[in-house]
Every structure is written in C-alpha cells, then in structure tokens.
Interface confidence: low
C-alpha cells in the first residue's frame, strides 16, 4: 500500500524526503523562509499529511503563499513612502518614513527604512518593530533671522515667520483689580507647551498672593503678526496654568510658567518651536548677543508709571524685535542695588540691554523669549524671559532689561511637561 | 565657597525625637534648595525630603511623611529636620544637600553628614 | 516609585583600566541622571549631571552617557583615588531615588 510520489511545494520542502510512502508514513510540508503554508485559506508554519491504508493521501500538498506585511501604519507627522516597485508590502520589500520636514524631524536620527519580515512585520534594524517619532523641529525658523538690528524700543517691524515660536497671551481676568484684561508673550516649546513668565499669569490680586489665573481666562495665539488681524493666527484655550512653586512677587525670583493649550497646535512656517538650552547653571555670557519679539510698548517717551497710573494700553500693532546683549551679573546687580527702591538680581536672573539705553523690552512684552543662537546645535535657544526691569523709561541710561535665566529651569519644565499631571503623554525635545 | 555644616553626632533613646542642624555659608541661603539624605551604614542612599529657604515651601517622599518635618531659619541660614518617633531603622547618617542651581534636583554640595544612633 | 537598579555590587579593575558602572531605570526618566562618588566616612561628591555633563573640577577621565533607561558612567585610565561606591540617581520624577550603589576595587 503505497503512497504516489510527492511534489514539493513552489517555495517548499517535503520533510522527510523518502523514494517510497507506505502506510503511516507521515511527512512534514514546511515553507521557505518568507512564505507560509496555505490550506484552505488558513495560513500555517508546517503542514503534515499521511499515508492511508488505501494508498492515498490523507490531504493534498498545500501552496506556499509569500509572508504579507499589509499596509504599513501611519506615522504622525510623517509620512510612508515605498521603495519597492508596486507598493509591494510582501517578504523583504522595504518602505521608509519619514517626517514632515521641515517641521518635524525623527528621534533617535534612524534611516527610517523598514523591511517586511519572514514573521510578517515591518521591522527596523534600531526600532525592531516600533514606529519611529516624529519630534517637532525646535529654533530653526523657515525665515532666517538677521544678522543686524538697528536701533519693542528702538526695535523694528518683524516679518511675519521671523519669530515662529512667539505667542500672545491674553489674560480676562475677573479677580483682577482694577483691570480685568491684560497680555503678555510666551514661547511655544511644543505642539502642546507655551513657555511664559509667571507674572504675566498670576492673578493680580491686591495682595501678595500668588494664584495662577483660571484656565478658562487664557487665551493663546499663534502665527500672529499684526494684532489687528488675527484671522491668520491660530487661537487655543489652556488646559493647565502651572507657575513656578516659588515664584516670587516681590523680587520676581522664579519667575517662570508653563501653559498646557488644550489641543496640539499644527505646525507649520509661521508656527514653530523654540529650544530648551542645556541645564547649566551660568547662562548666558555677557556680551552675547540676543533677540527678543514682543507687542509691548514701543513708545519710548512713556514711563511705565504713567502707564499703569492712566491704564492705557499702548501696545505695538505688528510684532516688534530687538538685538540686546548679555550684560554682566556684577554689573546688572551694581546697577540695580545702587538704586532707591528693593531690587534683587537673583542667580535665576541675567540681564540685558545697553549702558547707554536706547534698546530695551517693555511692558506687554513680558514672558517673551530671549532668544541667541547656539554655534553648536545651530538653534535658536530660549535663555530668558522677558521679566521686569526699573521704574524709569524702558531703555533708559543704565537700566538693564532682566530676565529669568531659563537654564535653571530645565528640569522644572522637563518634570512638568512629562508628569503624570500633564493632560496627556507629550515627548518635548530637549 | 559654599559649605553646609551639619550638627555633631547624636545618640537618642527609641521613641524619642531629634532635631539635626544644617548651617549653610558662602551662597544665598534663601535662594537654593536644601534636601536631606539618609544613608544606612553599608547602604545606599534615600532622599526623605527638600525645602525652599525663600517660601518655607516643602515637599516630603511618602516614605518619610510624619517622620521627618523640616524648616529653615533665614536669619542663620540654617535648616532643620526634626526626626521623631526615633527606632532601629533609624539609625543611620543623614545628610542634607543643596542643588548645584535652583531647579534641579541634583546635589553639588553636600554636609558632611550626622550619624544618628537609637538605641536604648 | 523610580528604581534604579545597579546590578553590580561589586566591580573588581586594576590602575590604568576603563571600567564602566551601569545603571537601569524602571521607567523611562529621560536625560535625568546624576553620578556620584563615595569614599568610606566621607560625604558623595557630583561627577555627571544629565546623564552625560561633567560636573566642574571632575577629572576628563569620567564620562556619563545614556538616556531613558540606561545609563552608563565610564572612568577611563583609573586611578587608585578612584576606588570608592558610586551611586546613580533619577530626578525625572519625585521622589527622587538612588541606586544601591557599585563598589570599585582592586583586583
């Protein structure tokens, strides 16, 4: 009672390989590598059939089918293109993500290249079988910033993109006395992150408490150039106000904060985050040069008094920017404390601006970032925030401009950006 | 050059309480953060606890809540940890350390430690 | 709570080897992570600071490097003052955690 010869399957082995099949005989039907036993529609690794008494077959000789990837998944902010001819998404066929430049670029830099497996599964030599992350593009506006500034105060029209990273903030509070509304600027540091000042939302009451204004009182815009027109901008609502816990109204020390927007904002030429700078304690050196953006004041023949007494506004229509240098500590603190009144430089401070005025950030451009050039990593970098500065005119003689020094805030921003508490799960790049 | 001088050994009967000193020089006390470490002899290390000199602001590890209290004496730029309901387990060398910049919990200057021993 | 395990108790080296302590995080706690060294009856002194910078007056020969779980600090050419435990530490979430600590000796 013998069994006919077997055919191996196309792609396939008959194990063991025997001159003659007699009853009981069994035989294993197995697959090369990338492809998979077909029996009736069911995919399988091995396949067996037997010799009968009657000298067939208990089952024909399945096909050996090629192992399918399917479609690959969707990378967001990415996108999947294939580099095998017919978008083949079968056994060693090969795609390659890649990010939205040049607004998002990839973690970890991988080639983005990846293969169907013999297991049918899109693997990556460094990712195995995880998607790679798209991460957003930090300091690198699509417009390059310039060179040279002329004589914010003394400042110019900036062009639209110029300053990617820069929000408006808009505060209505109804706790505030006298004044129920006020602005200030931040800095996008993600799709979901908005680096400011703690001042500019601490609720103003009369007291020396510091409250953080309710959520629903914020408002955030984006890719805003021209403050009459905010039909360009993109508007978001905040999901958290967090304030440094020792922010300090006296003296302004600590003065740093964080708004969560409620959803990721898109990202594109006008809306573009800015870079963290490393944890390191000294900031930046004296005499770097920085720019900052604001639609603060830009009158300089006003005093900051005056304005707070007569309780107008007289902000900048388009955003305004300013170069600055770094001012020495020792000379900022001599500066300050010579003065009549109790100024505090602190070491979570660096100053800025000319011995001779002229140049300087003013009121409405508070929680606006200082921002210089990294050589190194060639980003824009955040070292400060618009702060505060003396009672005189903005850009008086010898008044410095000061600035909470963000490098001693890494890990602060780091803690809350990733912690439990955060509305959801954000990667920021560091 | 900053220093932090932590008070002399201590020997504490079990149950009692004990309050250990940290006088910090050479920096702006109310400026920087001012953690404690506990160490047990052939151990590693365990932070129980961190204040703000500048607010009194504190925040405790769960671990050590109702055990350790601290607080800061601006006038002497000094800090405490008061250790109460003293046993065994309580017998070790704490530290207290200050960040190397105000953020970031990392510590760059540290006491030279006191060893509590409880025993009766 | 964060563990940071140093799965090495003990590493034996002689003067002029590399040698590399090594430490895992139960979580992903990104670049945040400090090196300390010890010696017996002193207090622990920073080497590293997120994860790869050297602290000031830390000796070239000490590097740290690692992000998310896996950190790494690498003392090249030891020398005999380098004979100490060293610790790890997370401070990407509170409460801040150490490592149990890797003891550095001669063969």
């Known amino acids: 009672n013998e069994c006919p010869k077997l055919q191996p399957p196309v792609y396939g082995k008959i194990e063991p390989s025997q001159a003659v099949y007699s009853f009981k005989d069994q035989v294993l039907v197995s697959c090369d590598t990338g492809y998979k036993v077909l029996k009736d529609n069911g995919v399988m690794d091995t396949f067996q059939i037997e010799c009968l008494k009657d000298g067939a077959w208990s089952n024909k000789i399945p096909t050996c089918k090629i192992v399918d990837c399917g479609a690959p998944a969707g990378l967001k902010h990415g996108l999947v293109t294939f580099s095998t001819r017919n978008n083949l998404t079968t056994y060693k066929s090969e795609i390659r993500y890649s990010c939205q430049q040049p607004y998002y670029k990839m973690l970890h830099n991988t080639t983005g290249v990846y293969t169907c497996s013999a297991h049918g599964t899109w693997t990556n030599e460094v990712l195995k079988r995880s998607l790679p992350t798209c991460l957003p593009v930090c300091g690198q506006p699509s417009r390059a910033l310039p060179n040279l500034v002329k004589r914010i105060i003394g400042g110019r029209n900036a062009e639209l993109g110029l300053f990617p990273w820069q929000a408006l903030i808009v505060v209505e509070d109804t706790s505030r006395v006298p004044n129920d509304k006020w602005f200030g600027s931040g800095a996008l540091l993600s799709e979901s992150w908005i680096l400011t000042a703690a001042h500019v939302l601490r609720s103003q009451r009369r007291d020396n408490t510091v409250i953080p204004v309710s959520k629903e009182h914020v408002t955030v815009y984006l890719g805003l150039h021209d403050v009459r027109d905010k039909s360009g901008a993109v508007n978001s609502s905040a999901a958290r106000v967090i304030l440094h816990p020792d922010f300090n109204i006296q003296n302004y020390n600590h003065d740093i904060a964080l708004v969560q927007l409620q959803k990721p904002v898109p990202l594109g030429a006008h809306v573009m985050p800015i870079c963290l700078p490393r944890p390191e304690p000294e900031g930046p050196a004296p005499h770097m040069l920085g720019l900052v953006a604001g639609w603060g004041i830009s009158n300089p023949n006003v005093t900051v008094d005056e304005i707070i007494l007569s309780g107008t506004r007289t902000l900048s229509d388009v955003l305004q920017y300013v170069k600055l240098p770094v001012v020495s500590h020792a000379e900022c603190k001599a500066s300050y404390e010579s003065r009549s009144g109790n100024y505090s430089v602190t070491e979570n401070m660096f100053c800025a601006g000319y011995y001779e005025g002229g140049k300087d950030t003013c009121l409405g451009d508070s929680g606006g970032a200082f921002v210089i050039f990294d050589e190194m990593s060639q980003h824009w970098v955040a070292q400060g925030l618009v702060s505060w500065g003396g009672p005189e005119e903005c850009g008086s003689k010898q008044v410095y401009g000061v600035y909470t020094k963000v490098s001693n805030y890494v890990d602060w921003l780091w803690e809350e950006m990733n912690s439990p508490r955060a509305v959801r799960d954000l990667q920021v790049e560091r | 050059q900053v220093q932090l001088k932590q008070s002399g050994a201590e020997l504490v009967r079990p149950g009692a309480s004990v309050k250990l000193s940290c006088k910090a020089s050479?920096?702006?006390?109310?400026?920087?953060?001012i953690n404690w470490v506990k160490q047990r002899p052939g151990q590693g290390l365990e932070w129980i606890a961190r204040i703000y000199p500048g607010s009194g602001n504190t925040y405790y590890n769960e671990k050590f809540k109702g055990k350790a209290t601290l607080t800061a004496e601006k006038s002497s730029s000094t800090a405490y940890m008061q250790l109460s309901s003293l046993t065994s387990e309580d017998s070790a060398v704490y530290f207290c350390?200050?960040?190397?910049?105000?953020?970031?919990?990392?510590?760059?200057?540290w006491g030279q430690g006191t060893l509590v021993t409880v025993s009766s | 709570d964060i563990v940071m395990t140093q799965s090495q108790k003990f590493m034996s080296t002689s003067v002029g080897d590399r040698v590399s302590v090594t430490c895992k995080a139960s979580?992903?706690?990104?670049?945040?992570v400090a090196w300390y060294q010890q010696k017996p009856g002193q207090s622990p002194k920073a080497l590293i600071y997120?994860?790869?910078y050297r602290y000031s007056g830390v000796p070239d020969r000490f590097t740290g490097s690692g992000s998310g779980t896996d950190f790494t600090l690498t003392i090249s050419n030891v020398q005999s003052e380098d004979l100490a435990d060293y610790f790890c530490q997370q401070y990407n979430r509170y409460p801040l955690t150490f490592g149990a600590g890797t003891k550095l000796e001669l063969k």
């Open positions: 997120s994860a790869s």
């Open positions: 050479g920096y702006t006390f109310t400026d920087y953060y």
């Open positions: 350390a200050r960040n190397y910049y105000i953020s970031s919990p990392w510590f760059a200057y």
């Open positions: 979580q992903n706690v990104g670049p945040n």
